[in-house]
């Protein structure tokens, strides 16, 4: 699986889950997060070689396609595929407020 | 929504799906599809800009650090979100068989 | 350009033998079933023998009206298949055409070799 | 087996005329949408010639006066106007399953 695992402990060029660190403030400017003050969100990133995690049965024949035809602009693209939630902490007024938000970090990629 | 209605009609540069057009024979090397010959497979391309057709509350959050930190490398990326089936004929020795391949079509695209 | 050279038709004996070969050219050889058919004199077409590629371990088919007499083989190396036809019968008097089909239907023929069974 | 029946057996015809040729099948040659049924010309002393395949489709080379219809155990061949070379026997031949079959044939002769 392409996955933290995997991707943190290799050098692999193709398509693997990247640590990528946000800091809320600093990089996106919510300053009503109060914690954490930043988490690793990771992103995916890495060209998609025919049938590697391929996604769908689509993934695999443009692939092969690309693969045949490397002229072509149209190949799978590494995207999420496991994402994991995150809690915060962040105040309405003086009431402190915690929330779990959905889809927050990446654990794994895929070709799609 | 960005599916084949919207983007086969207008000059969309962002991500949009785009046709694309698969000769079973010529472009996969699949000499054993005999019907159809080719099919529109389609596909997904075009940047993805802050809020997009945001798959996810992670696509959502990179798409707002890329669009903060513009020489980043981890931004979302434009792929299948709708596929829709296709029905093939094959023969198997001298018995015909027909399949219905899943996720074949792309019908509309996402920012993930 | 898809070739397909049949030989070895001729007059026989009724109860002998014949072997009939049929050189192919311009296509997947190995790819594609291969079959043999049939024109009697003054009758329709008849499929008579099959053999398809070695993806389905080439299985064959013969009508019952040649069973158990005919034998279709093929020669991937050669891009040849032939037809040895033992016990030959006045009703099997006919040109004999070596056709291949990619699909369903037989896309391409040979020119035809006559196979005369007369004493 | 699936047995095909051609109709008619025979049938006179003038240069132009519009011919069609039927072939009724014992039981349904279609799959899905797919109809497994084709059709052949033989002329005397020459090899038989796809002109459609799968009751539809034009064979490569094939003129367009020539046409095909048809689903499940009914099917056409239309010459839409009858040309000198034309003159031929017309086979049909499905692959719904094993073993193949032909029709008995159709002789198109002059008038």
């Known amino acids: 699986a392409l996955d933290t695992n995997y991707c943190f402990r290799n050098l692999e060029e193709n398509c693997c889950v990247r640590p990528l660190y946000i800091d809320f403030r600093q990089d996106l400017g919510w300053k009503w997060v109060h914690e954490p003050k930043g988490y690793y969100a990771n992103f995916c990133s890495g060209p998609c070689p025919y049938l590697r995690s391929a996604d769908t049965t689509h993934s695999t024949v443009l692939g092969l396609y690309n693969t045949l035809n490397p002229e072509a602009s149209a190949s799978p693209c590494c995207v999420p595929q496991d994402l994991e939630p995150l809690t915060i902490l962040y105040y309405v007024g003086r009431t402190p407020k915690v929330e779990q938000l959905s889809n927050m970090v990446v654990k794994s990629c895929k070709c799609s | 929504a960005l599916d084949t209605n919207y983007c086969f009609r207008n000059l969309e540069e962002n991500c949009c799906v785009r046709p694309l057009y698969i000769d079973f024979r010529q472009d996969l090397g699949w000499k054993w599809v005999h019907e159809p010959k080719g099919y529109y497979a389609n596909f997904c391309s075009g940047p993805c800009p802050y809020l997009r057709s945001a798959d996810t509350t992670h696509s959502t959050v990179l798409g707002l650090y890329n669009t903060l930190n513009p020489e980043a490398s981890a931004s979302p990326c434009c792929v299948p979100q709708d596929l829709e089936p296709l029905t093939i004929l094959y023969y198997v020795g001298r018995t015909p068989k027909v399949e219905q391949l899943s996720n074949m079509v792309v019908k509309s695209c996402k920012c993930s | 350009e898809v070739q397909l050279l049949e030989s070895g038709g001729g007059l026989v004996q009724p109860g002998g033998s014949l072997r009939l070969s049929c050189a192919a050219s311009?296509?997947?050889?190995?790819?594609?079933?291969m079959s043999w058919v049939r024109q009697a004199p003054g009758k329709g077409l008849e499929l008579v023998a099959d053999i398809v590629s070695k993806t389905y371990n080439y299985t064959t088919y013969y009508s019952d009206s040649v069973k158990d007499r005919f034998t279709i083989s093929r020669d991937n190396s050669k891009s040849t298949v032939y037809l040895q036809m033992n016990s030959l019968r006045a009703e099997d008097t006919a040109v004999y055409y070596c056709?291949?089909?990619?699909?369903?239907?037989?896309?391409?023929w040979g020119q035809g070799t006559l196979v005369t069974v007369s004493s | 087996d699936i047995q095909l029946t051609q109709s008619p057996s025979s049938l006179s015809a003038s240069v132009g005329d519009r011919v069609t040729i039927t072939c009724r099948a014992s039981?349904?040659?279609?799959?899905?949408?797919?109809?497994?049924m084709h059709w052949y010309q033989h002329k005397p002393g020459k090899q038989p010639k796809l002109l459609i395949y799968?009751?539809?489709n034009l064979a490569s080379g094939i003129p367009s006066r020539f046409s095909g219809s048809g689903s499940g155990t009914d099917f056409t061949l239309t010459i839409s106007s009858l040309q000198p070379e034309d003159f031929a026997t017309y086979y049909c031949?499905?692959?719904?399953?094993?073993?193949?079959?032909f029709g008995g044939g159709t002789k198109v002769e002059i008038k």
């Open positions: 056709t291949v089909a990619p699909g369903g239907s037989f896309d391409y």
């Open positions: 311009g296509f997947d050889f190995n790819s594609y079933g």
């Open positions: 799968r009751a539809s």
């Open positions: 039981q349904s040659v279609s799959i899905s949408r797919f109809n497994l």
């Open positions: 031949q499905h692959s719904r399953e094993s073993p193949w079959t």
